[in-house]
Interface confidence: low
């Protein structure tokens, strides 16, 4: 097909030779076509399109990608010729960097349903080059981690050496969707949640006297938490003796703080020591009374419906455990005098 009518976009991928890096191209069809029909602007309000639109705003998966060989050969179907490039809906993923990725990439709808659809295509001229030694040594990584529950930021690798004042306007995408409010070289995340994870793309325009290019970088963002290095601590009971009245009901609460663990299997239980006997007690279920992203306070009560003489000779032991270790706190009941 004739690609002369395709809109053209120039992109620059400057890759680091020190790290693994990915790159993406979006099928950036002109906005009217992207959002509804390629030929919608040619219809009067009362006209009805003869055919269904080739692409709706919510479904950009029916596109075909081609590469235009530099020697003028016919267009090549990406899927057949380039195993290191994969298509995911309207996005083309480059799994490995290299200058051999330079070239012209064309995307268009798979189904051409009307003469107008022929011009519904975009040509992306991609230039790929390694970062020079003169480039910023401490540029942001293409793999960035955000700590859950804390403040974090996502930096645009190709601009991370520039101050905010020097930085050009940046266009950010997350998982292929435009983040219209983000315009600087750094996205500040006030509080990190798991939904902040994903593939972020930052674009900015670089111009010279002849032409302008979109400089693009891709950042894989992972939301993580640091596993606790501490065993749980018992917040309550604090004292090892408790004054009680015989024949009265009694609830002893065990509250323990567990640091965050990705694989979280907290243990909180009561057992009784009576002479040389020791047995675990069937008590109400443990309940979480406070949960943050960093830790969790869990409570489990032991209920004595009546305190007996026998109970005064027992030790009531709260046992808590995580993957690091365990802690215990024992309570001896003492009859209240007077």
């Amino acid at each position: 097909f004739n690609i002369s009518g395709c809109s053209t976009k120039k992109l620059l991928w400057t890759y680091s030779t020190r790290s693994e890096e990915e790159f993406v191209l979006f099928c950036d069809l002109p906005e009217p076509q992207k959002s509804h029909f390629c030929h919608r602007n040619r219809l009067s309000p009362k006209q009805v399109p003869e055919h269904l639109p080739f692409m709706g705003s919510n479904d950009l998966s029916d596109v075909q990608w081609y590469q235009q060989p530099s020697n003028g050969d016919p267009l090549e179907d990406i899927r057949k010729s380039y195993p290191h490039i994969i298509q995911d809906k309207c996005t083309l993923h480059f799994l490995t960097p290299g200058v051999n990725n330079s070239g012209s990439y064309i995307c268009r709808p798979k189904m051409i349903k009307s003469p107008y659809d022929v011009a519904c295509c975009v040509k992306m001229i991609l230039e790929v080059k390694p970062q020079t030694n003169a480039s910023c040594e401490y540029s942001a990584s293409h793999k960035q981690d955000l700590l859950l529950g804390s403040t974090g930021s996502i930096s645009c690798p190709s601009l991370s050496c520039q101050s905010d004042a020097q930085s050009p306007a940046v266009t950010w995408y997350k998982n292929g969707k435009l983040l219209s409010v983000e315009r600087s070289n750094r996205i500040v995340v006030d509080e990190v949640y798991d939904y902040h994870q994903g593939t972020y793309v930052c674009d900015y325009t670089q111009s010279d006297t002849v032409s302008s290019w979109t400089v693009r970088a891709v950042v894989q963002v992972r939301t993580i938490v640091g596993d606790t290095k501490l065993k749980p601590d018992i917040l309550d009971p604090v004292e090892d003796t408790l004054e009680v009245e015989l024949g009265k009901p009694l609830t002893i609460s065990c509250k323990a703080r567990f640091g965050f663990e990705r694989v979280f299997n907290p243990v909180i239980k009561w057992y009784i020591k009576d002479s040389d006997l020791e047995w675990e007690v069937s008590v109400p279920e443990a309940k979480s009374i406070k949960s943050t992203l960093k830790d969790e306070i869990i409570e489990r009560n032991i209920i004595l419906e009546k305190v007996t003489q026998r109970d005064l000779r027992r030790k009531f032991v709260c046992f808590v455990q995580n993957s690091i270790g365990n802690t215990t706190q024992s309570v001896q009941l003492k009859e209240k005098r007077g």
Epitope: L246, G247, K248, P249, W270, I272, V281, S282, V283, I302, I303, L304, E305, K306, T308, Q309, R310, D311
Partner: antibody, heavy 122, light 111 residues
Framework: EVQLEESGGDLVQPGGSLRLSCAAS?????????ICWVRQAPGKGLEWVAC?????????YYASWAKGRFTISRDTSKNTLYLQMNSLRAEDTAVYFC?????????????WGQGTLVTVSS | DIQMTQSPSSLSASVGDRVTITCQAS??????LAWYQQKPGQAPKLLIY???KLASGVPSRFSGSGSGTDFTLTISSLQPEDFATYYC?????????????FGGGTKVVIK
Amino acid sequence: EVQLEESGGDLVQPGGSLRLSCAASGFSFNGNYYICWVRQAPGKGLEWVACIYAGSSGSTYYASWAKGRFTISRDTSKNTLYLQMNSLRAEDTAVYFCVRDKPAGGSSYTLWGQGTLVTVSS
Amino acid sequence: DIQMTQSPSSLSASVGDRVTITCQASEDIESYLAWYQQKPGQAPKLLIYQASKLASGVPSRFSGSGSGTDFTLTISSLQPEDFATYYCQCTLYGVNFVPNVFGGGTKVVIK
């Protein structure tokens, strides 16, 4: 006067169900004691059936043979104890007593109802 | 579950006799034991709780003793109104509720 009065005893066929009630007067079904059901088959001894704690937890306890078939419950607003009996068998024929224990010194039953007779027979 | 074994299952006695009924627990229940008296067609009545404490309104001729596994109910001088069936009961409770098991009963009849 502090007393317990059972009702609901009847002749029922094997496999049938019955709900016994026990109305309390002179005290509230909300305190530091157990309210229980004890039964006595004709000419036999006393057999503990189930207890419910009258405190806020409302913990329930059952004799091993009663678990799954019998359910003890209370309605504090009506000051009434219940025993729901399902899948009744001939051996469940007995006088069912509603009892309340002593607030201290062990779970000894200081207060007994007059009993209600349940007969399971075809 | 704890088992309570009462003996004898029946005994014949005369008014004025000293009567002793024993109850054995299958495990140590300390002093968590009660004794009841039941007359035909009536509900049982608490006589003794915590092995040796006399319930309210119970005549002093009734007494209880023992702890651990072996318990005794003694009627120092049998009265006509004492001819009845007597039951012991484990009244132990704690964190794990112990079923309130009764002994098999001892029937005291006139000789």
